[in-house]
């Protein structure tokens, strides 16, 4: 029976051109985790493997970098990079467990809108 | 399915070089990375080096960057483990891995290598 929980950021917003982390945490449930895909619709962007290690994507290496821990770090980003995200969890015995997080990447935040229009 | 036969090991003076060879067949196209580890007697099993499937990323092991090169060749759907400089501290039964996008790794039979001093 898969008594698990998936928790993640949910529904995130960044700035185009930074940087932002996807995090997914597994709890309630004493499976081991042997995997953690990471997919973006349905374009795989990394795998955290327990023996293997950290593999990303070769479409994304510029722009994708491991963690912290079993999350994912996205840089450079472009509105494309708009959309949902997955962390698919591979456990066992228990089965795979499947997280999503919304991303929306902005043009421009509105703190420097109200930074150029300040009023001495 | 991902099945994996292991080839090459042996006994070799230090100093030495052996080339060890896996091959893979089944649900290949499954594969994103493989790896090759070793297990020496009375220790843990330890990653020496892995490699993505499409060749462009690798890693070693600290005690064997610089004397063991991992490659592999699509096309024969084989992963290589070219060691040189062999030490006897580099004896165990080597073993090599295969991890799919489904979660699951695939382990072959595993190859002695023996190295005396």
């Known amino acids: 029976m898969m008594t698990g929980t998936i928790e993640t950021t949910g529904n995130i917003s960044a700035e185009k051109g930074g940087s932002i982390i996807l995090q997914c945490h597994l709890s309630s449930t004493t499976a081991q985790v042997t995997q953690v895909n990471w997919e973006q619709q349905d374009q795989l962007l990394a795998i955290c493997n327990a023996d293997l290690g950290w593999h990303i994507s070769p479409s994304f290496k510029d722009r994708v970098a491991p963690g912290p821990g079993l999350g994912l770090t996205l840089q450079s980003l472009t509105v494309n990079d708009t959309g949902e995200y997955f962390c698919i969890y591979h456990t066992y015995p228990d089965g795979t467990y499947t997280g999503r997080i919304f991303l929306e990447v902005l043009e421009s935040s509105v703190a420097e809108h109200g930074a150029r229009f300040q009023i001495p | 399915e991902v099945q994996l036969v292991e080839s090459g090991g042996g006994l070799v003076q230090a100093g030495g070089s052996l080339r060890l060879s896996c091959a893979a067949s089944?649900?290949?196209?499954?594969?994103?990375?493989m790896g090759w580890f070793r297990q020496a007697p009375g220790k843990e099993r330890e990653l020496v080096a892995s490699i993505s499937w499409s060749g462009d990323t690798t890693n070693y092991a600290d005690s064997v960057k610089g004397r063991f090169t991992i490659s592999a060749d699509n096309a024969k759907n084989t992963v290589y483990l070219q060691m040189n400089s062999l030490k006897p501290e580099d004896t165990a039964v080597y073993y090599c891995?295969?991890?799919?996008?489904?979660?699951?790794?695939?382990w072959g039979q595993g190859t002695q290598v023996t190295v005396t001093s």
């Open positions: 891995a295969a991890g799919s996008v489904y979660g699951r790794n695939s």
């Open positions: 089944g649900s290949t196209f499954s594969i994103y990375a």
